[in-house]
Interface confidence: medium
């Protein structure tokens, strides 16, 4: 339905809390490098009108769209071109261009220094001085490192933030109580990072078709027991949602999203059995908890798949009359029966199974031809099944920070061109699939591996875009996001490659390593095996564990020396001369 | 959208059978789980049957017409059967064909996306 004043409409609808949350969090994201004071200044400003919208929709500008006024807001700040260059060109557009110029000039990586906690103490002192102010440091800092972070699901963060805060700065030992919930609340928001960039690449890239077929497979999956029409509408409304959070509608998505939470709760009998203890919850809870809710059981009686779509005399038919409906029954009756399947490995089985169609239903006895399709899946899912098994062994083998150094090496050598820190840190995220996945039982290790991987990979292909440099990259990131994740497991080392010179300042250490973070020194050590890598892209394992050990040791002897510098000042030296010696 | 024509509606015989039919205009006829409905004067409409989005689907039925009506549907043709043996004179009513997302819905008579034929007539004389 159509309202005079859509910013008064959003206002109603969320509350100015969460409004405001969402207007800090849109300004964050669009213009990353502005200070938190500037931010909040333009969210007052935008909440005072708001206000007067829903006192008066006909005063004035009220009928303006929220791009409109967003974007007339960040087109006032003083200096714009200075801070921001060529951005500010955008500011000459009208909507909706000026709202796509602002899109394309987000940046993935800005050039912002890590986000540092602070001390306990000091976090709580701020937190209880002003806990809204405190939160809404948060939400900005997080916004602006991560300009396509799920809105909403950023304030459910916050909310988690608050909880913890409010929980642990009444304890006596704060840190103890602090570290490891913020650590996870973290951790669970970084993985959430990378696969909401994935979800707005694959609008971005492939749009809403190929978005809503992966929003088809994971609903089935989730919901085996709702029927296909039924997850048609959940699909087309996570489409739709995302699309607007995406796309830096944020007020709509948010709307949007509770909307469907609400829709989902009562609905519960034709969707899910497992819906109840989330509907029972506050509205941004309830939707995280309805997207992370356990799969429904699947029914008992489910036929075989190969009735409708192989044996079946009308195959051709049904697939002529109405291809996106019958490939979508297709996928939903596969997905329904394999939660125990990557929705990446679901989609290239979707994409198989329409590839055959076309090609058998132009034949002269279609039925025979179609007629293996089913078998013909099966090396398609025992790739995946052993990629799993070959990685989760080699985690449990060397640990996670063994197993990131493991595929550090190996992806250096896939693609030397790319910069070190991207390579460090797509192999630290890689790495931690380990942790994250190879402890969970059989059924569940194969989604979990495959779609955090492909997330993590999509994430490496946003950063190369920016400065392509391997050709080998470029293909892999090129191609249908389904066959990205296979596309990088099947490249091997990059025979063009020049090696690197080797230069003693990339291998020469100080003694401020010492009084690092713990993260921070397995950074400085897996910097210096990527860059060895780089110079011996042939180096073979026994030599850089031999070099990697030496250098472990040195640290560790400098470390504990009375006069440090003078430790590395002069053992450095022998260090660097030994490795050479040691890849020749 | 969906539009729904039915047929094969008539008098006969309490004991005897029928086969109503409903065609269905629109390309996503496969997206949707199909139903019958009746109305008998002066009453209430009420469910008959209910078959999910395929052609083996789970099929759901009244317990006033277990065992004597068959929901059947073949997507090739967009086209929903239902077969009406042992007919008694209660079963008189203007017999409705209806689609929706959901046939568990459809037995709640609250069809969430509900599109209606215009009736069949079927009257059992006894």
């Known amino acids: 339905e159509a309202h005079k004043s859509e910013i008064a409409h959003r206002f109603k609808d969320l509350g100015e809390q969460h409004f405001k949350g969402l207007v800090l969090i849109a300004f964050s994201q669009y213009l990353q490098k502005c200070p938190y004071e500037e931010h909040i200044k333009l969210v007052q400003e935008v909440t005072d009108f708001a206000k007067t919208c829903v006192a008066d929709e006909n005063a004035e500008n009220c009928d303006k769209s929220i791009h409109t006024l967003f974007g007339d807001k960040l087109c006032a700040i003083p200096k714009l071109r200075d801070n921001y260059g060529e951005l500010a060109d955008c500011c000459a557009k009208q909507e909706p261009e000026r709202n796509e110029c602002f899109l394309q000039h987000k940046d993935d990586n800005p050039n912002l220094p890590p986000f540092q906690r602070p001390e306990a103490e000091a976090m709580c002192t701020s937190f209880q001085e002003n806990p809204t102010s405190f939160l809404g440091h948060y939400l900005h800092e997080v916004a602006r490192r991560h300009p396509y972070f799920y809105a909403p699901e950023l304030l459910y963060y916050a909310e988690k933030y608050n909880e913890v805060l409010t929980q642990c700065c009444t304890e006596s030992d704060k840190a103890a109580c602090l570290t490891p919930k913020l650590d996870a609340v973290k951790e669970k928001a970084l993985v959430a990072a990378v696969r909401q960039r994935m979800k707005c690449s694959s609008m971005q890239r492939f749009g809403e078709r190929a978005f809503k077929a992966w929003a088809v497979a994971r609903m089935s999956q989730r919901f085996p027991n709702a029927e296909f029409a039924e997850i048609t509408k959940l699909a087309t409304d996570v489409t739709k949602i995302n699309k607007e959070c995406c796309h830096g509608d944020l007020l709509e998505c948010a709307d949007d999203r509770a909307e469907l939470a609400k829709y989902m709760c009562e609905n519960q009998a034709t969707i899910s059995s497992k819906l109840q203890a989330c509907c029972d919850k506050p509205v941004l809870q309830k939707s995280q908890c309805l997207a992370e809710i356990e799969h429904d059981n699947i029914p008992a009686d489910l036929p075989s798949i190969a009735a409708d779509f192989v044996e079946d005399k009308e195959v051709c038919k049904n697939y002529a009359e109405a291809k996106d409906v019958f490939l979508g029954t297709f996928l939903y009756e596969y997905s329904r029966r394999h939660p125990d399947y990557s929705v990446s490995l679901l989609l290239r089985l979707a994409k198989k199974y329409e590839a055959t169609l076309e090609k058998c239903c132009a034949e002269g006895d279609p039925p025979a031809c179609y007629g293996t399709v089913l078998a013909e899946f099966q090396p398609l899912v025992e790739e995946p099944k052993n990629l799993v098994k070959t990685n989760c062994e080699l985690y449990e083998k060397l640990g996670e920070y063994g197993f990131q150094n493991a595929v550090l090496v190996r992806y250096t050598q896939k693609a030397p061109q790319v910069s070190t820190p991207t390579l460090v840190e797509a192999a630290r995220n890689l790495g931690r699939v380990g942790t994250k996945c190879c402890t969970l039982p059989e059924a569940q290790r194969l989604p979990c591996v495959e779609d955090y991987l492909s997330a993590i990979l999509n994430r490496l292909c946003v950063l190369h875009e920016k400065t392509p440099v391997s050709e080998k990259v470029t293909k892999c990131c090129s191609g249908s996001l389904v066959e990205r994740r296979p596309c990088f497991s099947a490249l091997t080392v990059d025979e063009t490659y020049v090696p690197k010179e080797f230069k003693a300042e990339t291998f020469t250490f100080h003694s401020d390593i010492c009084t690092l973070p713990d993260k921070e020194k397995q950074i400085k050590k897996q910097t210096a095996l990527a860059e060895l890598v780089k110079h011996k892209p042939k180096a073979t394992e026994d030599q850089l564990k031999t070099v990697m050990g030496d250098f472990a040791q040195f640290v560790d002897k400098c470390c504990k020396a009375a006069d440090k510098d003078n430790c590395f000042a002069t053992e450095g030296p022998n260090l660097v001369a030994r490795s050479k010696e040691a890849l020749a | 959208q969906v539009q729904l024509v039915e047929s094969g509606g008539g008098l006969v015989q309490a004991g005897g059978s029928l086969r109503l039919s409903c065609v269905a205009s629109?390309?996503?006829?496969?997206?949707?789980?199909m139903g019958w409905f009746r109305q008998a004067p002066g009453k209430e409409r009420e469910f008959v049957a209910a078959?999910?989005?395929?052609?083996?689907?789970?099929?759901y039925y009244a317990d006033s017409v277990k065992g004597r009506f068959t929901i059947s549907r073949d997507n090739a043709k967009t086209t929903v059967y239902l077969q009406m043996n042992s007919l008694k004179p209660e079963d008189t009513a203007l017999y409705y064909c209806?689609?929706?997302?959901?046939?568990?819905?459809?037995?709640?008579?609250?069809?969430?996306?509900?599109?209606w034929g215009q009736g069949t007539q079927v009257t059992v004389s006894s």
């Open positions: 629109g390309r996503t006829f496969i997206a949707y789980a």
């Open positions: 209806a689609a929706d997302r959901s046939a568990q819905t459809m037995r709640q008579v609250r069809p969430v996306l509900p599109y």
């Open positions: 078959i999910t989005n395929f052609a083996g689907g789970t099929t």
